[in-house]
């Protein structure tokens, strides 16, 4: 779980090792700050969980293209 | 393919606990999410618990909370069900399930494991 | 925690016509940011493990046939075998995956008629 040191920054410390479909998430954001260990993604869920996952992992990538899209593309 | 296959049939006396396996094979542990769901005779689909994801551990039907634990072991790829102080009522068939990405549904289950509680 | 609630408990239907069990969540499992009702129905034969049917409410999995349909938003779903088949006979259920814990509904019982 991310982890707020000072806020605003949050950091992660872990990454989750398990697959998550997308169709779980809602939203994420990167955590690039210089303050933090290494860089993250959180994702938020549909029951609001967070979750810290390594950018580096290409269902983490995918998962964030996903969402990308998801918010471009316009409900009808 | 995920492919899950299960410990045999154990007989148990009430108070006694029972630790039940599930091997995992096609995929490793750490890709899954695994959870066990249980039957009792004539009876419906009962979810215990199992690893979430979202909450970065195991958790546990309230029901079964104090009662139930639940381990892997990633060097095998098994994880394990352990359900103390039985009673009649834990007489049931017992099922691990997964899916490869965790959306809380279950494509692979495990042929079941019959736990028999008697005195 | 969701309250699943199916209906019938059982349900005799001759060869070839449509059986219909619904399933009524207690909350919804509609997710509108993706439009997706997070309710799944599962098949339980006999001496077997449940078997995945239809998931985000109305997509068959590969390999079930198109006698099998889901329909329903919300907190109503409808499982329907439009021409029921001697293979059909069998335990449904269905389950919400919204939230945990995990929830089934009591299950529904299909004889043929």
């Known amino acids: 779980q991310p982890d707020a040191i000072n806020a605003p920054v949050t950091c992660c410390y872990n990454f989750t090792n398990r697959k998550i479909s997308v169709q779980r998430l809602a939203s994420y954001r990167r955590i690039t700050s210089s303050k933090c260990p290494k860089e993250a993604v959180i994702f938020k869920t549909i029951v609001a969980k967070e979750i810290c996952a390594d950018p580096k992992q290409k269902w983490v990538q995918d998962s964030m293209d996903h969402l990308d899209k998801q918010t471009q593309t316009p409900k009808t | 393919q995920v492919q899950l296959v299960q410990s045999g049939a154990e007989v148990k006396k009430p108070g006694a606990s029972v630790k039940v396996s599930c091997k995992v094979s096609?995929?490793?542990?750490?890709?899954?999410?695994m959870h066990w769901v249980r039957q009792a005779p004539g009876k419906g689909l009962e979810w215990m618990g199992g690893f979430d994801p979202e909450d970065g551990e195991t958790i546990y039907a309230q029901k079964f909370q104090g009662r139930v634990t639940m381990t892997e072991d990633t060097s095998t790829d098994t994880v394990y069900m352990e359900l103390s102080s039985l009673r009649s009522e834990d007489t049931a068939m017992y099922y691990c399930?997964?899916?490869?990405?965790?959306?809380?549904?279950?494509?692979?289950w495990g042929q079941g494991t019959l736990v028999t509680v008697s005195s | 925690d969701i309250v699943m609630t199916q209906s019938p408990d059982s349900l005799a239907v001759s060869l070839g016509e449509r059986a219909t069990i619904n399933c009524k969540s207690s909350q919804s499992v509609l997710y509108s940011s993706n439009n997706k009702n997070y309710l799944v129905w599962y098949q339980q034969k006999p001496g077997q493990p449940p078997k995945l049917l239809i998931y985000w409410a109305s997509i068959r999995e590969s390999g079930v046939p198109d006698r099998f349909s889901g329909s329903g938003s919300g907190t109503d779903f409808t499982l329907t075998i439009s021409s029921l088949q001697a293979e059909d006979v069998a335990v449904y259920y269905c389950?919400?995956?919204?939230?945990?814990?995990?929830?089934f509904g009591g299950g529904t019982k299909v004889e043929i008629k």
């Open positions: 096609g995929y490793t542990l750490t890709e899954l999410s």
């Open positions: 389950q919400q995956y919204y939230s945990t814990p995990l929830t």
């Open positions: 399930a997964t899916r490869e990405f965790w959306t809380g549904y279950f494509d692979h």
